[in-house]
Interface confidence: low
């Protein structure tokens, strides 16, 4: 065999991944590896994940002389330490006028009166806490309730006696009950006036309301 067959350790270089070959003897060599690689020929990518700094459940993904963190959906950033602002990502996260409040690792909704639940989609049953008088019917509304009174009862909670029950208004007048105090209100027909619509008035005057 001629000189072509002579073994030259660094020609060609056995070092891979950018490693630099250095001849250390007639038949020996040493590879100086770039950061991130190891092994006699720099063939191994060093696992940079052990003792990684990924936080909040982030999963480490090894790279070349570095690592990256694969973050759960509510976290972001190089090391999963930055909170994702769900309120920006989901403008309609809170329903029915609720206000979105970003929090570490999630978000919360501040609901307007009458709504509840994680996304303010549940109408609070105001009748559960209402004090309609027994015998009346409670109707749930948004952030309020109303009481439907049985015959003879009046007021917001049906706790008052209905003053209209005794027909105090005369001459075809309309009788209404003041929901605050239970007193009757007569709406007089044309030509009549007075609390009970019993008094005549001059022609040309329109309807009169009288409270009692």
């Amino acid at each position: 065999a001629g000189s072509d067959s002579l073994y030259v350790p660094c020609a060609p270089s056995p070092c891979v991944n950018g490693g630099t070959c250095r001849q250390t003897g007639d038949f020996t060599f040493e590879c100086n590896c770039l950061p991130g690689f190891e092994g006699s020929t720099c063939e191994r990518n060093i696992d940079d994940c052990p003792n990684h700094r990924c936080q909040n459940g982030g999963v480490c993904v090894d790279g070349v002389n570095t690592y990256n963190c694969r973050c759960p959906p509510q976290w972001t950033g190089q090391f999963c330490t930055e909170d994702v602002d769900e309120c920006l990502l989901q403008p309609n996260a809170c329903q029915n006028g609720g206000t979105c409040a970003n929090r570490n690792g999630g978000y919360g909704c501040v609901c307007v009166n009458g709504w509840s639940g994680d996304d303010c989609s549940e109408n609070i049953d105001d009748c559960a806490f209402a004090s309609c008088t027994p015998g009346s019917t409670c109707i749930d509304r948004v952030a309020s309730f109303s009481c439907m009174c049985p015959e003879g009862k009046a007021g917001l909670l049906c706790h008052l006696d209905d003053a209209c029950i005794s027909n105090p208004c005369h001459k075809g007048a309309l009788c209404d009950t003041n929901p605050l105090n239970g007193q009757y209100i007569c709406t007089c027909p044309q030509g009549y006036k007075g609390a009970d619509c019993t008094e005549d008035v001059d022609e040309g005057n329109s309807h009169h309301h009288h409270h009692h």
């Epitope: 003792n51 936080q55 330490t81």
Partner: antibody
Framework: EVQLVQSGAEVKKPGESLKISCKGS????????IHWVRQMPGKGPEWTGY????????KFNEKFKGQATISVDKSITTAYLQWSSLKASDTAMYYC??????????WGQGTLVTVSS | DVVMTQSPDSLAVSLGERATINCRSS???????????LHWFQQKPGQPPKLLIY???NRFSGVPDRFSGSGSGTDFTLTISSLQAEDVAVYYC?????????FGGGTKVEIK
């Protein structure tokens, strides 16, 4: 080439404030945690705490909690160690070091802090 | 905190001879991920520590092959197979398995 260059030596009086710096270059600054290590005269090194440059999140050795703060300015790839009120016992060499391979792979040259009345 | 105890405190070795430094931890350094985070550093006067060996036995880039590490669990060894004049320094072990990271007290290596 990875380099961490620290600010120069400081001589301070007890009660004074101080902020020392560590500028990283030659690598993606946000990709690596920066540690601060204290070495008191004639003693071995002590890990003080670290900062995550990407987020500014910090973690401290309980022994040093509340004594100093660590911050970062990503725009100039620089980490800081700061005291609001120095004590004589803070006299030491302070090193910054870059995280990697589960250890401290590259170190700054150190900043000597002397606190004396 | 995990206590790292190095021995001996100082060591005088002839040029070309073997130097052996021991490091013992107060608890096992085997991490839940299966790795052991025990590292060795060299520090020369007026210089910062320099990483020699990481995770028991892996030489850091540019570190001569006369430096080697071994051990497991709680007992670890740094060996300099043939001491050179430039190896005069203080050597520290460091564990980063358990929070917080803790260094050993150091071993001073001199030439006999």
């Amino acid at each position: 080439e990875v380099q961490l260059v620290q600010s120069g030596a400081e001589v301070k009086k007890p009660g004074e404030s101080l902020k020392i710096s560590c500028k990283g270059s030659g690598y993606t600054f946000s990709n690596y945690v920066i540690h601060w290590v204290r070495q008191m005269p004639g003693k071995g090194p002590e890990w003080t705490g670290y900062i995550i440059p990407g987020s500014g999140g910090t973690k401290f050795n309980e022994k040093f909690k509340g004594q100093a703060t660590i911050s970062v300015d990503k725009s100039i790839t620089t980490a800081y160690l700061q005291w609001s009120s120095l004590k004589a016992s803070d006299t030491a060499m302070y090193y910054c070091a870059r995280d990697g391979a589960g250890s401290f792979t590259y170190w700054g040259q150190g900043t000597l802090v002397t606190v004396s009345s | 905190d995990v206590v790292m105890t190095q021995s001996p405190d100082s060591l005088a070795v002839s040029l070309g001879e073997r130097a052996t430094i021991n490091c013992r931890s107060s608890q096992s350094l085997v991490h839940s991920d299966g790795n052991t985070y025990l590292h060795w550093f060299q520090q020369k006067p007026g210089q910062p520590p320099k990483l020699l060996i990481y995770r028991i036995s892996n030489r850091f880039s540019g570190v001569p092959d006369r430096f080697s590490g071994s051990g497991s669990g709680t007992d670890f060894t740094l060996t300099i197979s043939s001491l050179q004049a430039e190896d005069v320094a203080v050597y520290y072990c460091l564990q980063s398995t358990h929070f917080p990271d803790t260094f050993g007290g150091g071993t001073k290596v001199e030439i006999k």
